[in-house]
C-alpha cells in the first residue's frame, strides 16, 4: 500500500527522501540549523511518521520553527540595544550589552555582542552564555581640582571633587569619622572608628564596645557637614569587619570595612576610589579630605582638605620616638616638618589619596588613623597605609580596580 | 618555614620556654600565633604576637603564658606548668587572622 | 567570645564519595572562617579561607560555603588520603580583644 507523495516544511527536509513510500516505510521530519520542529505545539529536535497499512501516514507533516532566545536576561549597571530590526531575538539576531557609562566599565573591555544560538541561548564568542559584568570606575570624578597653590591649613573643598568621600554618621545625624567608597558596596575606614575610646587602664576590645551595624549609617555624596545636601544618599550597614590583626593600644593595622545594605547610585557626587597599584613614594602630594576639627577647634561647615607631602618611614619613625610610639610599616606619614596642615579629631577613617598623573585618576594611599594632637611641628599625621593591607582588602571584599 | 623547640619533661610548676625560629620570611616583621594540642583532643589557640610585639592572649591563658620576640625568635613561656598543659605546641604565621604556614610541633609533658 | 560547634565526630563516607561537615558560629561573623585538614602525627595545613577562598595549591575536590552564622566544608569524590581531623576557625574582630582567634572542635572523616 502507497502513502502519498511527502513535502518537505519549510527550512526543514525529511529523510529518507523517496520518490515512492510504502506500508511500514518511516521518514523523520528535521529541521535547518537554527529551526525546531513543531508539533502540536511542543518543539523536538526530530519527529517520525509512518506510512500505515491503509495508505495514510501516521501523522501530518510538522512545521519548523525559527529558534527564539527570548528577552535577553537584564544586566545590573547596563543596557541592552538590538542591532537587528523589531528587536528580533529569533536565531542569529544580535545584541549588544553596554555598561552605563560613564560610571560602570565592562570587565576585560568585552565586546558586549551576543547572538541568538541555534540552540536558542544568546551567546558572547568570550563568554559564552554567561552575561558580561558592569564594574564601576573608580577614581575619575566628573568635577576636577582647580589646580591648587599649595593649600596652607586646609581649604573647602570643590563639590564634587572627592566623590568617594564617606560620613559614618550616628543615626541622630551626628557625623563621627569619615570613609571612602570602594567597588559598589563597600566602605574602606579606620578600624578605631568603629568601637568606642578604650579605657587606658585595661585597653581591650570587648564585644560591647564595638558599634553593630544597626548603630550608624553611612552618608554618601555628602558636601556640608551638618546641612543637606541634594545629592546626598544615605546607606544602612550590613556588617563591619575590622582588621584581623588591628590593635586598638598602638593602632596598627588600623583599618576596617563597612559593607553596605545596599548599593549606592553612582553619579557625579558618588564614585568609588580606586585601590593602589604600588607603593607611594616619599615627597608624592597626597589630598587628605574631612569634615574633622580645624585649629580653632571648630567644626568646618563643609568638606575641607589639605595637599601635604608623604614623609620618609624613618623620618617619621624618629618624630614618634620620644612619645614611645611606633610608626609600624602598616602606616605611612603625610605633613610638613613645620605642621600647620593635618589631619584632626572627626578626620578619622576619611581618604588621602594621589593622582595619577599618566591615567588621570585617583588612587587611595591612606585612611586618616592618629598623630600628636593636630598640625604640631616635628609631628605628622599617621595614616593606615592601604597598599601594605590591600591583598586583605581584596580578600574580603572582592573589588578590584 | 617554621621550626618549635625547647619541649621536654617538665615538673609542675618549673617554667619552660619554648622557642620558634623561622626561615624564609623575617620573624621581626611577621605576626605569630602559638597553638596547642593535648594528646587525642583538639586545637587550642594560646595567643599572638604582633610585628610591632604587642600580644594579645585566649582569655583561659591569660597569666599562665608569655609571648616574647627577638629578631630571630618568638618564644612562648609557660610561667607555671600544670599536668593539664601536657600537649604539642605549634608556632604558626598569622596571615590575616589565617594561620597559613605551622612548624611541626614540640611536645611539652608535665609530671611529677 | 564566638564560639565555633562543630559536626560531631566521626564523619563516614565511602571512596568516591561525598562529605559536608558543619561549623556553627555562636555569633555573626561575617565571612571571617577558616578551615583546615590535620593528618594523624602532622600539623593543620590551611584549607580555606574568607568562608569559600581555596587556599592556592589545595585541590578543588574541597569547597567552602557560608549561611549567615553556619559555615560548611564539603568534600566531593573522596580519596583515602582526605581521611583527617577537620577544624574551623574564626578571625573576626568582635569578641573581646582576648579571644582574637578561636578553634571549632574538629571533625574526624574516616574513609570506608
Known amino acids: 500500500n502507497e502513502c502519498p507523495e511527502l513535502q518537505p516544511p519549510v527550512h526543514g527536509k525529511i529523510e529518507p527522501s523517496q520518490a515512492k513510500y510504502f506500508f511500514k516505510d518511516q521518514v523523520l521530519v528535521s529541521c535547518d540549523t537554527g529551526y525546531k520542529v513543531l508539533k502540536d505545539n511542543v518543539e523536538m529536535d526530530t519527529f517520525q511518521i509512518e506510512c500505515l497499512k491503509d495508505g495514510t501516514w501516521s501523522n501530518k507533516i510538522p512545521t519548523c520553527k525559527i529558534v527564539d532566545c527570548r528577552a535577553p536576561g537584564e544586566l545590573e549597571h547596563g543596557l541592552i540595544t538590538f542591532s537587528t530590526r523589531n528587536n528580533l531575538t529569533t536565531y542569529k539576531s544580535e545584541i549588544k550589552y553596554s555598561c552605563q557609562e560613564p560610571y560602570y566599565k565592562m570587565l576585560n573591555n568585552n565586546t558586549g555582542i551576543y547572538t541568538c544560538s541555534a540552540q536558542g541561548v544568546w551567546m558572547n564568542k568570550v563568554l559564552g552564555r554567561s552575561l558580561p559584568t558592569c564594574l564601576p570606575v573608580c577614581g575619575l570624578p566628573k568635577f576636577s581640582r582647580k589646580l591648587m597653590a599649595r593649600i596652607f591649613n586646609g581649604r573647602p573643598a570643590q563639590k564634587g571633587t572627592t566623590p568617594w568621600i564617606a560620613m559614618l554618621s550616628h543615626l541622630n545625624g551626628q557625623p563621627f569619622c569619615g570613609g571612602s567608597l570602594l567597588g559598589s558596596s563597600w566602605i574602606v575606614t579606620a578600624a578605631h572608628c568603629l568601637h568606642q575610646s578604650l579605657d587606658p587602664e585595661d585597653p581591650t576590645l570587648r564585644d560591647s564596645d564595638l558599634l553593630s551595624p544597626s548603630d550608624f549609617k553611612i552618608i554618601l555624596g555628602k558636601h556640608w557637614r551638618l546641612r543637606s545636601d541634594e545629592n546626598e544618599q544615605h546607606l544602612g550597614v550590613k556588617h563591619t569587619t575590622l582588621h584581623p590583626q588591628y590593635d586598638p593600644n598602638t593602632f596598627e593595622n588600623d583599618v576596617a570595612l563597612v559593607e553596605l545594605l545596599e548599593s549606592p547610585v553612582l553619579n557625579a557626587f558618588v564614585m568609588p576610589i580606586c585601590l593602589p597599584e604600588g607603593p607611594q613614594q616619599e615627597g608624592a602630594m597626597v589630598i587628605v579630605s574631612g569634615w574633622g576639627k580645624q585649629f580653632l577647634q571648630r567644626f568646618p561647615e563643609t568638606l575641607m582638605e589639605i595637599e601635604i607631602p608623604i614623609v620618609d618611614h624613618s623620618t617619621c619613625q624618629k618624630a614618634y620616638a620620644p612619645l614611645k610610639k611606633k610608626v609600624t610599616r602598616d602606616m605611612i606619614c603625610a605633613g610638613e616638618k613645620e605642621g600647620g596642615k593635618d589631619a584632626c579629631a572627626g578626620d578619622s577613617g576619611g581618604p588621602m589619596v594621589t593622582l595619577n598623573r599618566e591615567r588621570g585618576q585617583w588612587y587611595l594611599v591612606g585612611t586618616v588613623s592618629w598623630g600628636d594632637d593636630c598640625g604640631k611641628k616635628d609631628r605628622y599625621g599617621v595614616y593606615s597605609y592601604i597598599h601594605h593591607n590591600k591583598d586583605w582588602i581584596q580578600r574580603v571584599t572582592g573589588v578590584r580596580n | 618555614s617554621v621550626e618549635e623547640s625547647g619541649g621536654r619533661l617538665v615538673t609542675p610548676g618549673t617554667p619552660l620556654t619554648l622557642t620558634c625560629t623561622a626561615s624564609g620570611f623575617s620573624l621581626s616583621s611577621a605576626y605569630m600565633n602559638w597553638v596547642r594540642q593535648a594528646p587525642g583532643k583538639g586545637l587550642e589557640w594560646i595567643g599572638i604576637i604582633y610585628a610591632s610585639g604587642s600580644t594579645w592572649y585566649a582569655s583561659w591563658a591569660k597569666g599562665r603564658f608569655t609571648i616574647s620576640k627577638t629578631s630571630t625568635t618568638v618564644d612562648l613561656k609557660i610561667t607555671s606548668p600544670t599536668t593539664e598543659d601536657t600537649a604539642t605546641y605549634f608556632c604558626?604565621?598569622?596571615?590575616?587572622?589565617?594561620?597559613?604556614?605551622w612548624g611541626p610541633g614540640t611536645l611539652v609533658t608535665v609530671s611529677s | 567570645a564566638v564560639v565555633l560547634t562543630q559536626t560531631a565526630s566521626p564523619v563516614s563516607a565511602p571512596v568516591g564519595g561525598t562529605v559536608t561537615i558543619k561549623c556553627q558560629a555562636s555569633q555573626s561573623i561575617g565571612s571571617s572562617l577558616a578551615w583546615y585538614q590535620q593528618k594523624p602525627g602532622q600539623s593543620p595545613k590551611l584549607l580555606i579561607y574568607?568562608?569559600?577562598t581555596l587556599v592556592s595549591g589545595v585541590s578543588s575536590r574541597f569547597s567552602g560555603s557560608r549561611s549567615g552564622t553556619e559555615f560548611s566544608l564539603t568534600i566531593s569524590d573522596l580519596e583515602c588520603a582526605d581521611a583527617a581531623t577537620y577544624y574551623c576557625q574564626n578571625y573576626y574582630l568582635s569578641s573581646s580583644s582576648a579571644d582574637r582567634r578561636t578553634f571549632g572542635g574538629g571533625t574526624k572523616v574516616e574513609i570506608k
Open positions: 604558626a604565621r598569622d596571615d590575616y587572622g589565617t594561620a597559613d604556614l
Open positions: 574568607g568562608a569559600s
